[in-house]
């Protein structure tokens, strides 16, 4: 790291060292020699998150309705307002600008983690013995029935979208 | 009352490393950053850098940079000095000293040195 | 970096008399400068810091004054135990630098 010429939570003006303005505030005015760093608070619908030498506030980040985003956390003077997904939407990527709908696990596929605000359903394949005859954003994979619990046989056997047939034993069989 | 206590002199050869260390008392050691200054025999003072003891932040006079490290552990109050690639011209007395507390200072670093260790002096020779 | 040029590099002075040193910045450092004495084998002590401000418990035949880049320390009336080495450090800005040194001797 190259050396600075002045401390943390200062910087350089006019071969000066000035303090920054802390979380929350703008830049007024520069230090002189007989006079501090002026700051003033961000307004209500701004913020700044960290020591610095900004003359402007940023916007707290708009969450628009209209791209399915909604408020998870308002914004305050140091921190912008974080947005998060409607039910049954989530975000398209990490700073949550915009919604898709969730993914549906089609027939054959079982949900392994339901979806939330930030993340999308993962799907997995049902394994044997399981199945998914639904195209589902919430299902999981079901156990095939046993047919021997109920005191029947397997007429037709299971596959990873359709459950065994149970049907009466053959008579026949001793 | 205010304490910096430096480690013994060493002796090391052209080539090796060197580690000082500056245990602090009598104070909040998060709240003061330390400085390292050394002064060659019959020579003058040399600042070498700083270290932020609440952050571990660093700053290193041009001079030392690449050669130097400044640590600090906060659970013992005691920041360390280590200089690599040692040279003959490195021989001198090391000082920890701590930054007077200048609740005032509106602009300008403000680092002047209220404390200062005993020093430590390295002699380096093959 | 800043330069700080002390002057006289040393003085022969008599217990009683007026000693001044005068330390140079090769450019502005508004009042961000303090004052060392240091004596043999000992780490330096602060006398004065922002031109002129005393530190606490320091003498007050000890002053300072000057800004931007001239500045001056005088010792009123010399007492024995001021023969010493006195250095100049400006703290306007990183890098931190010291004067050459000024010894004061037994005259």
């Known amino acids: 790291e190259p050396p600075t010429a002045c401390r943390e939570k200062q910087y350089l003006i006019n071969s000066q060292c000035c303090s920054l303005c802390q979380p929350g505030q703008k830049l007024v005015s520069d230090c002189t020699e007989f006079t501090e760093t002026e700051c003033l608070p961000c307004s209500e619908s701004e913020f700044l998150d960290t020591w610095n030498r900004e003359t402007r506030c940023h916007q707290h980040k708009y969450c628009d309705p209209n791209l399915g985003l909604q408020v998870q956390q308002k914004g305050t003077s140091e921190t912008d307002t974080i947005c998060t997904c409607e039910e049954g939407l989530h975000c398209t990527s990490e700073s949550c600008e915009s919604c898709v709908p969730h993914r549906s696990c089609l027939p054959g596929f079982g949900v392994k983690q339901i979806a939330t605000g930030v993340s999308d359903t993962i799907c997995e394949p049902c394994p044997v013995g399981f199945f998914s005859n639904v195209s589902s954003a919430f299902e999981k994979c079901r156990p095939w029935t046993s047919c021997e619990t109920k005191d029947l046989v397997v007429q037709q056997a299971g596959t990873n979208k359709t459950d065994v047939v149970c049907g009466p034993q053959d008579r026949q069989r001793a | 009352q205010v304490q910096l206590v430096q480690s013994g002199a060493e002796v090391k050869k052209p080539g090796a490393s060197v580690k000082v260390s500056c245990k602090a008392s009598g104070y909040t050691f998060t709240g003061k950053y330390m400085h390292w200054v050394r002064q060659a025999p019959g020579q003058g003072l040399e600042w070498m850098g700083w270290i932020n003891p609440d952050s571990g932040g660093t700053n290193y006079a041009q001079k030392f940079q690449g050669r130097v490290t400044m640590t600090r552990d906060t659970s013992i109050s005691t920041a360390y000095m280590e200089l690599n690639r040692l040279r003959s011209d490195d021989t001198a007395v090391y000082y920890c000293a701590r930054d007077q507390p200048l609740g005032y200072c509106t602009n300008g670093v403000c680092s002047y040195f209220d404390y200062w260790g005993q020093g430590t002096l390295v002699t380096v020779s093959s | 970096d800043i330069q700080m040029t002390q002057s006289p590099s040393s003085v022969s002075a008599s217990v009683g008399d007026r000693v001044t040193i005068t330390c140079r910045a090769s450019?502005?450092?508004?009042?961000?400068l303090a004052w060392y004495q240091q004596k043999p084998g000992k780490a330096p002590n602060l006398l004065i810091y922002t031109a002129s401000t005393l530190q606490s418990g320091v003498p007050s035949r000890f002053s300072g004054s000057g800004s931007g880049t001239d500045f001056t320390l005088t010792i009123s009336s010399l007492q024995p135990e001021d023969f010493a080495t006195y250095y100049c450090?400006?703290?306007?800005?990183?890098?931190?630098?010291f004067g050459g040194g000024t010894k004061v001797e037994i005259k």
């Open positions: 450090q400006q703290a306007n800005i990183f890098p931190l630098t």
């Open positions: 450019q502005g450092i508004y009042s961000w």
